[in-house]
């Protein structure tokens, strides 16, 4: 299920291909599209242009991150008079043009979404031949990828003075709340580190001092679900080592 949020500044228009030419280039994209990790999403993009009945060569491009400078994730080219836009680039084979650029539609389908796909995307069209012109969306469309929590790492590490601490790292969107439970802990939120720079979907919770042997469970939960993982601490009494 894909939700598309549309605001008044860039409303989606269906542009009739043979209408009189527009005054200027314009691109219509929604501010945001939301979809769940693992699913597919459609990034809508339609445009108007000032060139009457253009049927020369064209290239459709989508890039991620920022306009102009961001890396291309999809590119296709259509020959003069052709309605077929031949794919030249589809990053990891997951991007596919749904729209028909000849009918002013550059809408893109993204398959098998991952949290790393959560970023802004910019559509661009280039005309070549007699008319040489190009245009790229200025604000782009934000692809918001949601995901149920997944614990990516749980571990026990030595601390100074023969103590031990536990770390739990989980990913999800919205970022999950983490809680530790274990011997003499009850249910503890522990010390939760805010998402790290460049790792916006990762959250880490630390149990700074494990005082009892036994099973420690980390639970990650957000509005889409929960996940848990456990780690066991068993210290050899009288020795400085521990088994986990």
């Amino acid at each position: 299920f894909v939700r598309t949020k549309i605001d008044t500044t860039e409303n989606l228009l269906n542009t009739e291909v043979h209408s009189s030419p527009a005054q200027r280039w314009s691109m219509q994209v929604p501010p945001e599209v939301s979809a769940e990790a693992g699913d597919a999403a459609v990034l809508p993009c339609t445009f108007t242009h000032p060139h009457r009945h253009y049927d020369g060569p064209l290239t459709a491009i989508w890039r991620a991150g920022e306009p102009y400078a961001g890396p291309q994730v999809f590119r296709c080219a259509a020959a003069r008079g052709s309605e077929l836009c031949q794919t030249a680039l589809s990053l990891h084979g997951r991007f596919r043009l749904l729209g028909n650029p000849r009918r002013n539609d550059l809408s893109l389908r993204v398959e098998r979404l991952a949290l790393a796909d959560d970023r802004r995307y910019f559509c661009r069209v280039e005309f070549a031949g007699d008319v040489h012109d190009r245009y790229e969306s200025r604000h782009g469309v934000r692809l918001h990828v949601t995901a149920a929590p997944r614990i990516v790492n749980i571990s026990v590490l030595p601390s100074p003075a023969h103590a031990f601490r536990a770390l739990c790292t989980a990913e999800g969107e919205p970022p999950p709340a983490l809680a530790w439970s274990g011997p003499a802990l009850g249910n503890s939120l522990a010390a939760v580190r805010s998402p790290r720079e460049g790792h916006g979907h990762l959250v880490t919770a630390e149990l700074p001092a494990l005082t009892h042997d036994g099973r420690y469970t980390c639970t990650a939960a957000n509005s889409l679900g929960r996940s848990e993982a456990s780690v066991y601490l068993f210290r050899f009494h009288g020795a400085s080592g521990a088994s986990t």
């Epitope: 008044t8 500044t9 409303n11 005054q23 200027r24 314009s26 102009y68 245009y135 790229e136 200025r138």
Partner: antibody, heavy 118, light 115 residues
Framework: QVQLVQSGAEVKKPGASVKVSCKAS????????MHWVRQAPGQGLEWIGR????????KYAPKFQGRVTITADTSTSTAYLELSSLRSEDTAVYYC???????????WGQGTTVTVSS | QLVLTQSPSASASLGASVKLTCTLS???????IDWYQQQPEKGPRYVME???????STGDGIPDRFSGSSSGAERYLTISSLQSEDEADYIC?????????????FGGGTKVTVL
Amino acid sequence: QVQLVQSGAEVKKPGASVKVSCKASVFNIKDYYMHWVRQAPGQGLEWIGRIDPEDDKTKYAPKFQGRVTITADTSTSTAYLELSSLRSEDTAVYYCVRGWLGYIMDFWGQGTTVTVSS
Amino acid sequence: QLVLTQSPSASASLGASVKLTCTLSSQHSTYTIDWYQQQPEKGPRYVMELKEDGSHSTGDGIPDRFSGSSSGAERYLTISSLQSEDEADYICGVGATIKEQFVYVFGGGTKVTVL
């Protein structure tokens, strides 16, 4: 911080030519159109023309056609405006402007004053 | 012919609102325009792109006190909670490709005085 740094003020005699430069930093001029706009003392803005540095294609306002040349050097990220057969009415502040593809002129240089006087 | 008409001046008190009008020539009443601000002794600054339906997209660093609206051939720029730094000329501009010829026209500008 996007910057368009223009060359300094010029004083020219009628009939002469002037060449004004505009150096861009923090962005690649190949990705934009570069426009030139002028403003005579106490007057409004007047569009002169633009260049697409990607392929050096230019568009000029009919009023300036034949008297103006806009060029760009992508290796130095610099745009140039050359205006020939100067007359006193060409006395103005000349602005180079970054043009988003399409029509929006979203970033303006500081301006270069050109004075034409005998 | 593509023409933009603006009234020469407007004034309002500090903290009040002012609404500026830019009128397109009748045969171009559907056109999208751009608004620019020019403070005294400075170069122009891009304020917003304003469409026929009133939707608008503001430039970087433009406060949300600046808004746009449209009615027929008229395009409006409203500045609310007027500040002293808003004292400037406000110029509308319109770019179009007409019969494969690119043109860009500016209005005469409206001088806003903050009382």
